[in-house]
C-alpha cells in the first residue's frame, strides 16, 4: 500500500514538475526590466528564451521573436537545449511511469518489469529536473553578470549633457517557476526510485532435487526462473534492475522567428 502511494505521489509530483518546466520554457518573463533605483519609465521590457517583449503603460504589448539562430548568445542556446532535454526526458519518463503504476494493470506484466520501468522513469525524472534546474541557474548567472556590468556603466554620458539610461534586467517569474518545477520533478523522480525498491518481488528459491532416470545418472538442478537473467542456478536473493532503453524520439520544436535584441 505504502509502495503504491509513494509511486502514485511520485508520479503526480513529477507530472506537476514537468508541466511547470514546460510552462517556464514557454514563458516570456525569464528576465524583466529592473525597476529598483531606476527612472520610472512608461515602457516595461521583459525577455524569454524565444522572444523579447515590451509593454507600454498604454497597455499595448509588442513581442518580437529572435529571428536568428546562429546570432544568439551561446549561453541562451545552452539554456534552451537544457530545458528542451528536460522536457523530452520528462515526457518519456511520464509515459514510462504510466505503464509502471502499480494501480494500472496491463496484461500480465510482472512486478519485476514494473519495478524496472519505475526505476527508469525515476531516473528520467531526476535527470529532467536537474536539466531544468541547471538551465534556469545558467540563465540566472548570466543575468547577475550582466546586471552588475550594466550597473557599472548605468549612465553613459554623451557630450557631458545628455544621458542614456541603460536598461538593467533582473530575475523574471519564469526563473522561479523553473526552479520550483525542476525541484518537484527531482523529488518525484526520487520517490519513484524509492517506490521501485518496494515493487521488486522477493525471489522464491527452490531446493535442488535429484531425479534419477533409469540407465542415466544425470542430475537436473533447476534454478529460480528469472525473466531478466534467463535460466540458471541462483542461490543468492539478488535484485537485478534493468535501466531500460532511452530513446530521444520526441523533439520539441518551437516557432523559429527569433532575433535577439
Amino acid at each position: 500500500m505504502a509502495v503504491t502511494a509513494c509511486q502514485g505521489l511520485g508520479f503526480v509530483v513529477s507530472l506537476i514538475g514537468i508541466a511547470g518546466i514546460i510552462a517556464a520554457t514557454c514563458m516570456d518573463q525569464w528576465s524583466t526590466q529592473d525597476l529598483y533605483n531606476n527612472p520610472v519609465t512608461a515602457v516595461f521590457n521583459y525577455q524569454g528564451l524565444w522572444r523579447s517583449c515590451v509593454r507600454e503603460s498604454s497597455g499595448f504589448t509588442e513581442c518580437r521573436g529572435y529571428f536568428t539562430l546562429l546570432g544568439l548568445p551561446a549561453m541562451l542556446q545552452a539554456v534552451r537545449a537544457l530545458m528542451i532535454v528536460g522536457i523530452v526526458l520528462g515526457a518519456i519518463g511520464l509515459l514510462v511511469s504510466i505503464f509502471a503504476l502499480k494501480c494500472i494493470r496491463i496484461g500480465s506484466m510482472e512486478d519485476s518489469a514494473k519495478a524496472n520501468m519505475t526505476l527508469t522513469s525515476g531516473i528520467m525524472f531526476i535527470v529532467s529536473g536537474l536539466c531544468a534546474i541547471a538551465g534556469v541557474s545558467v540563465f540566472a548567472n548570466m543575468l547577475v553578470t550582466n546586471f552588475w556590468m550594466s550597473t557599472a556603466n548605468m549612465y553613459t554620458g554623451m557630450g557631458g549633457m545628455v544621458q542614456t539610461v541603460q536598461t538593467r534586467y533582473t530575475f523574471g517569474a519564469a526563473l522561479f517557476v523553473g526552479w520550483v518545477a525542476g525541484g518537484l520533478t527531482l523529488i518525484g523522480g526520487v520517490m519513484m526510485c524509492i517506490a521501485c525498491r518496494g515493487l521488486a518481488p522477493e525471489e522464491t528459491n527452490y531446493k535442488a532435487v535429484s531425479y534419477h532416470a533409469s540407465g542415466h545418472s544425470v542430475a537436473y538442478k533447476p534454478g529460480g526462473f528469472k525473466a531478466s537473467t534467463g535460466f540458471g542456478s541462483n542461490t543468492k536473493n539478488k535484485k537485478i534492475y534493468d535501466g531500460g532503453a532511452r530513446t530521444e524520439d520526441e523533439v520539441q520544436s518551437y516557432p523559429s522567428k527569433h532575433d535577439y535584441v
Epitope: A42, S52, G59, V261
Partner: antibody
C-alpha cells in the same frame, strides 16, 4: 466614434477642492490607459496624471502628487481627477486623453477650465 | 525630469515650402527592448485640443497627411512638413513618452508670411 467629454471645472479659491469627470464612449474604456493633461494660460502643455488599465497603476506629476488623485469607474466608463489644496499655478484647461501605442495621446476631450483665484 | 527643447519657437512660412522643426531631449528616448524612440508630435490649432500626428518618432497616425514626416533617434528629433499648406498653421509640440513625468516641449508656432 471615440468621445471624451470633461466636466466639473470652474472657479475655486486657493486651498479649495474640485472633482473633474470625463465620460468616455466609442472604445473599450476598461482596456485603455487614460490621462489628464493641462494647458496653462501661457499655452504650455503639462501632463498631470495617468491611470493604466487592468491593475490601475497611477502616475503623477511631482507638483500634484499628494494633492490630486486620478481614478476610474470602468462600469460607468468614467475617469476622475480629484483635486485638493489647489494653487494658482493649477489654473489651466484640463484635458482628458486616451493613451495609445507608443504611449501617445491619440484622443483628447474638448477640455474643462479650472481657475484658481481668490 | 526630462527636458524637451523645441526650436525655433516660431517660424514664418509660405505655402508650398518645406518646413523643418527640431526637438531635443535631455535623455535618450530610445528603448533598447524594441529599438523604438518614444517621442510623439502633436498639432494644435487655435481653440482646439492637440491632435496626434506622429508617435514612435516616425510612425504617422492614421488619417495624417503623408506630407508630415517624423525622424531622428535617441535625443535629436525632427518634424518635417513637405509642401506646407495654409491648414497646417498651428503650434507643434513634441512629447517625451518614455520617462515619467511625460514632458512636452514649449512648442513651435507656424505663422504665415
Amino acid at each position: 466614434e471615440v468621445q471624451l467629454v470633461e466636466s466639473g471645472g470652474g472657479l475655486v479659491k486657493p486651498g479649495g477642492s474640485l472633482k473633474l469627470s470625463c465620460a468616455a464612449s466609442g472604445f473599450t474604456f476598461s482596456n485603455s490607459a487614460v490621462s489628464w493633461v493641462r494647458q496653462t494660460p501661457e499655452k504650455r502643455l503639462e501632463w498631470v496624471a495617468t491611470i493604466t488599465s487592468g491593475v490601475s497603476y497611477t502616475y503623477y506629476l511631482d507638483s500634484v502628487r499628494g494633492r490630486f488623485t486620478i481614478s476610474r469607474d470602468n462600469a460607468k466608463n468614467t475617469l476622475y481627477l480629484q483635486m485638493s489644496s489647489l494653487r494658482s499655478e493649477d489654473t489651466a484647461m484640463y484635458y482628458c486623453t486616451r493613451q495609445f501605442k507608443g504611449n501617445a495621446l491619440d484622443y483628447w476631450g474638448q477640455g474643462t477650465s479650472v481657475t484658481v483665484s481668490s | 525630469d526630462i527636458v524637451m527643447t523645441q526650436s525655433p519657437s516660431s517660424l514664418t512660412v509660405t505655402a508650398g515650402e518645406k518646413v523643418t522643426m527640431s526637438c531635443k531631449s535631455s535623455q535618450s528616448l530610445l528603448n533598447s527592448g524594441n529599438q523604438k524612440n518614444y517621442l510623439t508630435w502633436y498639432q494644435q490649432k487655435p481653440g482646439q485640443p492637440p491632435k496626434l500626428l506622429i508617435y514612435w518618432a516616425s510612425t504617422r497616425e492614421s488619417g495624417v497627411p503623408d506630407r508630415f514626416t517624423g525622424s531622428g533617434s535617441g535625443t535629436d528629433f525632427t518634424l518635417t512638413i513637405n509642401n506646407f499648406q495654409a491648414e497646417d498653421l498651428a503650434v507643434y509640440y513634441c512629447q517625451n513618452d518614455y520617462f515619467y513625468p511625460l514632458t512636452f516641449g514649449a512648442g513651435t508656432k507656424l505663422e504665415l508670411k
